[in-house]
Interface confidence: low
């Protein structure tokens, strides 16, 4: 029998054989961390000769070469050091911005042993555009330097680097770039499991939250799937079992898929799982049309019954056919449910492709993806209804370009990964959905549709009132805690008489809750600076109320996201190691940040939070207020850095009874509270007959209107002290 020669050692590395020295066997080289094999593999041909992929000569000497990370091609509005052609593992590159520009991202990045830079792309931004400066990742070249609504930027990679992410991005109306950040990588680079798990988990958790943002099933319920919402998820698991996948690796593919299924079923979402193995042809082991696809035991059992030998007669990798079988399944389900029905249109679809190589038969898999996108009517509005995760395993023949082409492109998310081996894959699936702490009360979800009620649009909004008249507003920040202003309680009257009115789907009047305890900031004292001629001072104007019972989460009652928490990090789709400072840089990233508060009548009103130099000019106006501050010499005595400032130009001003309400912004269709309404120089409700009418200040008013809101980024120690076991805070 023919066999291939055995003189294939690699200096400094090792190799494995998929099927011994026989024809069809794949020889895979590996090197110690920080080195990569060249070539990566060889195939034993039927002629008894080794063939090296993409090699000109039949047998080149295999060597372990040092991994290097790509150099910046250009860095705008700043400098980087040192300037090298490429960087060795462990090497650092540092970034600094010119005056007037703020550094976003990582000031220092280190080259990691997988050929990838740690940290995030450094960008020097002045906050001038409609969208933030999208930056230029290391090794990339960008064309396009306008960041207005509708502007496009294009990226390409230098020399032999491969682009993953979006080659073209557009600045959208919501101030966010379309697609996902492009990254230029060495063809031999791969991802570490500890990076993939949170990236995959964040994206997946966001999808789960959108499917059905309710509590995680308690283990004691025996994983009973509670089918109680209209949201439904179809999960399609595609497992490569072509010849180049060893039987052992196929077992790990199966095990990883089982882990995934197990986790998915632990969420209270309606889910159907399809399982397809593929080589030259696909084999559907479980279809979403089968009622058993909703039953964890049936799904796991069909996974366990998947046989490596199922595909022994066809050993190619036909990714097109695998994805096409998903398309056919979708088509059948659409016929069954009816194309125009909500039942069909409300299903979210997630495809996870586990492969060890690029497709080598059956045509371009991209064609099947295009068909899938078309049948699901995926457009900007329905982008959340499809997620395709393309995971390459083994650094062999995995084609970055193809994986990138197949994976979804969503801002702040990654859907295409290459892992070093199946062990790494197993680690990823073990850790990716470990978000049990985060899904209980998914935060910052408001109904944005035109026919939603005010309370459905801002379900965190609550009214705080004594037995007599309404006094203050507040925001649910968990299912039992409300954040509000301390000055609402300055008369110190008995809190047992107070009530908190929370939204309730059953009643247009909401539901009343008693207050179990009020935690008022000890630093708040409205008369603290009376002897300095400052008649009222609102520093530390913050309070927390613990409700006597937990609020049942609903369309009308749901917490807002508090920045600097893991819950908000998930909603922002930021990487796991993010800090509080990262959140501040992302949310308050311009000199004028559009934000909102809720009016007495429940409607959402617009303001602009002034930052940097604009904050100074916004606050300076206070010196013109001679009644409250007769002999004020330093504005900062009154407007400390605890306050955000609004009230310029076309801003609405809050009324007296709106104190304590959230000052919030929208990012990625989620809402984040950055401040709370504290005090101002003008009350638009004064003298108006009802709560629907507000009077704008006359242009000639001295001082002009200004409003000051407690900045939650400046109250972190206090918030952490009292909410440490309620929310999961990030490092500062």
């Amino acid at each position: 029998a023919t066999s291939c020669p055995q003189n294939v050692n690699i200096s400094g590395g090792t190799f494995t054989l998929s099927h011994g020295w026989a024809p069809g066997s794949l020889l895979i080289y590996s090197c110690p961390q920080g080195l990569y094999p060249s070539p990566a593999s060889r195939l034993c041909k039927s002629s008894g000769q080794w063939q090296t992929p993409r090699a000109t000569r039949s047998l080149t000497k295999a060597v372990c070469k040092p991994v290097r990370c790509p150099a910046p091609v250009s860095f705008e509005n700043g400098i980087y050091t040192p300037r090298l052609g490429s960087y060795p593992v462990g090497g650092n590159v540092s970034f600094e911005c010119e005056d007037g520009f703020i550094l976003r991202g990582s000031p220092v990045r280190q080259c990691r042993p997988n050929g990838m830079w740690d940290g995030e792309t450094a960008v020097c931004d002045n906050g001038a555009g409609h969208c933030p400066n999208p930056g230029i990742s290391l090794g990339a070249v960008r064309t396009g330097s306008r960041f207005g609504h509708g502007d496009k930027v294009r990226y390409r990679c230098s020399s032999n680097l491969v682009l993953t992410g979006s080659a073209e991005r557009e600045c959208q109306g919501n101030g966010v770039w379309s697609g996902t950040e492009p990254i230029c990588r060495q063809p031999y680079s791969y991802d570490f499991p500890e990076d993939v798990a949170p990236a995959l988990g964040t994206s997946f958790s966001h999808m789960l939250g959108a499917t059905n943002p309710t509590q995680r099933t308690k283990e004691s319920l025996g994983r009973k799937i509670q089918i109680q919402r209209s949201g439904h998820l179809n999960l399609y698991l595609l497992l490569d079992s072509s010849q180049s996948v060893s039987e052992n690796d196929f077992l790990i593919f199966k095990e990883s898929a089982s882990l995934m299924v197990d986790r998915i079923f632990s969420f209270e979402i309606n889910v159907s799982v399809a399982i397809i193995t593929f080589a030259s042809e696909p084999k559907v082991l479980m279809s979403v049309l089968n009622v058993n696809s909703r039953d964890i035991t049936e799904v796991i059992s069909s996974l366990e019954n998947a046989k490596y030998k199922d595909h022994e007669n066809g050993t190619g990798t036909n990714t097109y056919a695998a994805l096409n079988s998903v398309y056919l399944m979708m088509n059948n389900q659409m016929q069954l449910l009816g194309m125009k029905t909500m039942a069909w249109q409300e299903i979210r679809h997630a495809i996870i492709l586990l492969t060890d190589g690029k497709s080598n038969m059956g045509g371009s898999p991209k064609t099947a993806v295009d068909q899938i996108r078309e049948i699901l009517n995926i457009n900007q509005k329905r982008n959340d209804y499809l997620d395709i995760y393309a995971i390459g395993v083994g650094k062999l023949d995995v084609d970055w370009r193809e994986l990138n082409e197949l994976g979804s492109k969503k801002d702040g998310e990654r859907h295409a990964f290459i892992l070093q081996d199946t062990k790494a894959l197993h680690q990823v699936f073990e850790h990716m959905l470990d978000v049990s702490k985060l899904t209980d009360t998914i935060c910052g979800v408001g109904n944005m549709s035109a026919n939603a009620s005010d309370q459905e649009r801002t379900p965190w909004h609550v009214t705080i009132k004594p037995k007599s008249q309404e006094t203050c507003r507040g925001a649910l920040i968990s299912d039992q805690w409300v954040l509000t202003a301390a000055h609402c309680f300055r008369d110190g009257n008995d809190h047992s008489l107070w009530r908190v009115n929370v939204g309730d789907p059953k009643s247009q009047w909401g539901k009343e809750f008693l207050i179990e305890k009020a935690v008022i900031s000890p630093g708040f004292d409205v008369f603290a600076k009376k002897n300095q001629g400052i008649l009222e001072f609102y520093g530390d104007d913050i309070a927390l109320l613990k409700l006597a019972q937990k609020v049942k989460m609903s369309t009308h009652a749901r917490p807002i996201c508090l920045p600097c928490t893991m819950e908000a990090n998930l909603a922002l789709r930021r990487p796991q190691g993010s800090t509080c400072r990262d959140h501040e840089n992302e949310l308050l990233n311009k000199q004028s940040v559009p934000a909102h508060f809720v009016a007495l009548n429940g409607s959402k009103l617009n303001i602009n939070l002034k930052m940097g130099v604009e904050w100074t000019s916004c606050a300076e106006v206070v010196s013109q207020e001679k009644t409250m501050f007769p002999n004020l010499t330093d504005v900062r005595e009154v407007v400390t850095d605890q306050f955000l400032c609004s009230g310029t130009q076309e801003d609405e001003s809050p009324c007296k009874g709106e104190s304590g309400g959230a000052v919030f912004l929208e990012r990625r269709f989620r809402f984040f509270q950055v401040g709370l309404v504290s005090w101002g120089l003008y009350n638009p409700c004064l003298g108006s007959a009802d709560k629907n009418s507000r009077k704008r200040a006359p242009r000639s008013k001295v001082p002009p209107p200004r409003d000051f809101h407690i900045n939650l980024f400046r109250m972190q120690p206090w918030l952490r002290q009292h909410l440490g076991d309620v929310l999961n805070f990030l490092p500062l």
Partner: antibody, heavy 119, light 106 residues
Framework: QVQLVQSGAEVKKPGASVKVSCKAS????????MYWVRQAPGQGLEWMGI????????TYAQKFQDRVTMTRDASTTTVYMELSSLRSEDTAVYYC????????????WGQGTLVTVSS | SYELTQPPSVSLSPGQTASITCSGD??????TCWYQQKPGQSPVLVIY???KRPSGIPERFSGSNSGNTATLTISGTQAMDEADYYC?????????FGGGTKLTVL
């Protein structure tokens, strides 16, 4: 497993400075804060300050504000505490301790570094 | 500045229940942690967030906190529990330790 390994004992003269290192391993360095606490012979624990390994931001106890500097090197997962203008009452064991958030406490401590200030 | 007060010493026989108190102004509104320190060793966290036990700490250690006083309770005290115990809380952004209590098991 989590380990915080501190540098060895130091003997310093009054007016000098000392720099103590604390090498962290076995966990995600940037997810946890690092605190410094000291203990004079036969005395109680005294908090000196905190450093955020991810960004390097610090908060010092009022008492040490002018004399202490805490830094970190994320590439080697090491934090440093430098105390200047040493006096004899600074003779103490200096501990680094890891903590997730204030209310979670300092869940892992280094073995301590004895600093002796003597003329 | 904020202060925490602990009794300097507590003595009891093995098997008895030890209660070590820690008092401070409105301490019940703050979270308290407790540390055990044996001679020549680094401190060990035994209670965090008033009453939670880190993994590896025996169930006989418990904590409570209300009003102006936090209490560490060790039920069925053993000879190995003989050590110094420190309470700790946060005031604004500063950690504050109590003076420590020497627990002697006779």
């Amino acid at each position: 497993q989590v380990q915080l390994v501190q540098s060895g004992a130091e003997v310093k003269k009054p007016g000098a400075s000392v720099k103590v290192s604390c090498k962290a391993s076995g966990y995600s360095f940037t997810t946890y804060y690092m605190y410094w606490v000291r203990q004079a012979p036969g005395q109680g624990l005294e908090w000196m300050g905190i450093i955020t390994p991810s960004g390097g931001s610090t908060t010092y106890a009022q008492k040490f504000q002018d004399r202490v500097t805490m830094t970190r090197d994320a590439s080697t997962t090491t934090v440093y505490m430098e105390l200047s203008s040493l006096r004899s009452e600074d003779t103490a064991v200096y501990y680094c301790a890891r903590g997730y958030e204030g209310s979670y406490g300092f869940d892992h401590w280094g073995q301590g570094t004895l600093v002796t200030v003597s003329s | 500045s904020y202060e925490l007060t602990q009794p300097p010493s507590v003595s009891l026989s093995p098997g008895q229940t030890a209660s070590i108190t820690c008092s401070g102004d409105k301490l019940g509104n703050k979270y308290t942690c407790w540390y055990q320190q044996k001679p020549g060793q680094s401190p060990v966290l035994v209670i965090y967030q008033d009453n939670k036990r880190p993994s590896g700490i025996p169930e006989r250690f418990s904590g409570s906190n209300s009003g102006n006083t936090a209490t560490l309770t060790i039920s069925g005290t053993q000879a190995m529990d003989e050590a110094d115990y420190y309470c700790q809380t946060w005031d604004s952004s500063t950690a504050v330790f109590g003076g420590g209590t020497k627990l002697t098991v006779l």
